[in-house]
Amino acid sequence: ESALITQQDLAPQQRAAPQQKRSSPSEGLCPPGHHISEDGRDCISCKYGQDYSTHWNDLLFCLRCTRCDSGEVELSPCTTTRNTVCQCEEGTFREEDSPEMCRKCRTGCPRGMVKVGDCTPWSDIECVHKESGTKHSGEVPAVEETVTSSPGTPASPCSLSG
């Protein structure tokens, strides 16, 4: 919990403008939910529901809260110490290799395959070949059996920082 974030840890777009960069203050760091003032003397609260910081830091700005996209539900709101937690709506999922959007889950498995895993907010339905038991990967085939999935699944703390 005593991890800290400094200016150098941030992605370029999150860093302070060059003229505002300064060395670490002798005073130390500011707690989660705060950022440091430009003169390095004071800690300033992040604004509730607008921005946040999760660790002890010497950031000149708090980080902007993520806004959930349409197609996502807000699992927990942004606080001054924690970003918004968004999750794909029922019947959709977010893949690791395309985290920018929620995709519709398939409604069933291709012929010759059986469903072994439901649609969850973080994975499509899982299909395996009846005989071999190997997983199916790839695009949804044109012909599908009427094996339908149940999209109702427990929530996951799948937080995206925007």
Epitope: S2, G28, L29, P31, D42, S45, K47, Y48, W56, T81
Partner: antibody, heavy 119, light 107 residues
Amino acid sequence: QVQLVQSGAEVKKPGASVKVSCKASGYTFTEYILHWVRQAPGQGLEWMGWFYPGNNNIKYNEKFKDRVTITADKSTSTVYMELSSLRSEDTAVYYCARHEQGPGYFDYWGQGTLVTVSS
Amino acid sequence: DIQMTQSPSFLSASVGDRVTITCRASQDVNTAVAWYQQKPGKAPKLLIYWASTRHTGVPSRFSGSGSGTDFTLTISSLQPEDIATYYCQQHYITPWTFGGGTKLEIK
């Protein structure tokens, strides 16, 4: 339950120093910031500074920076506040208080320690 | 430092009255204001934080509102046990500062 138990009342002469202790229990010591707040007789509250045992971070109110030292003993979950070069206007009840590592409000307070500075 | 000016400094009201205490910050503090209740010889107790969020176990008759520079603590129906001094505090920027207090007494 959460408890912050402070040391007893002190009477000091002007120019002397005083060291007040605050023993924390009922929660994980390294997860909360501990503060010192003072209250002169019949007066309002004044924040003096904090100590965070999780990373030894200390911050002082500039007003007291030259005279106050906050330390801790993690083995006993105790925080100390030492105020030097005492003057009569330092006569006050000194409270320790804690806050989570988020917004700076205080959810639990010690019972207070009266420090009297008198010649 | 941010000055927190509380008014009134003294207030006399009857049981069952609606009581309002105000606090004005010398500069914008967003919604970073807390309210405390202090009884004689005791430490302050947290009532409200983030201007309007009631702390655990605080009766619903206590409510807070405001943002920017003007904040209000309201007791919807004054009870005998509410007799105390009330303080506002800004937790927006260090040094965190308190109002001068409002002493509430029963008529």
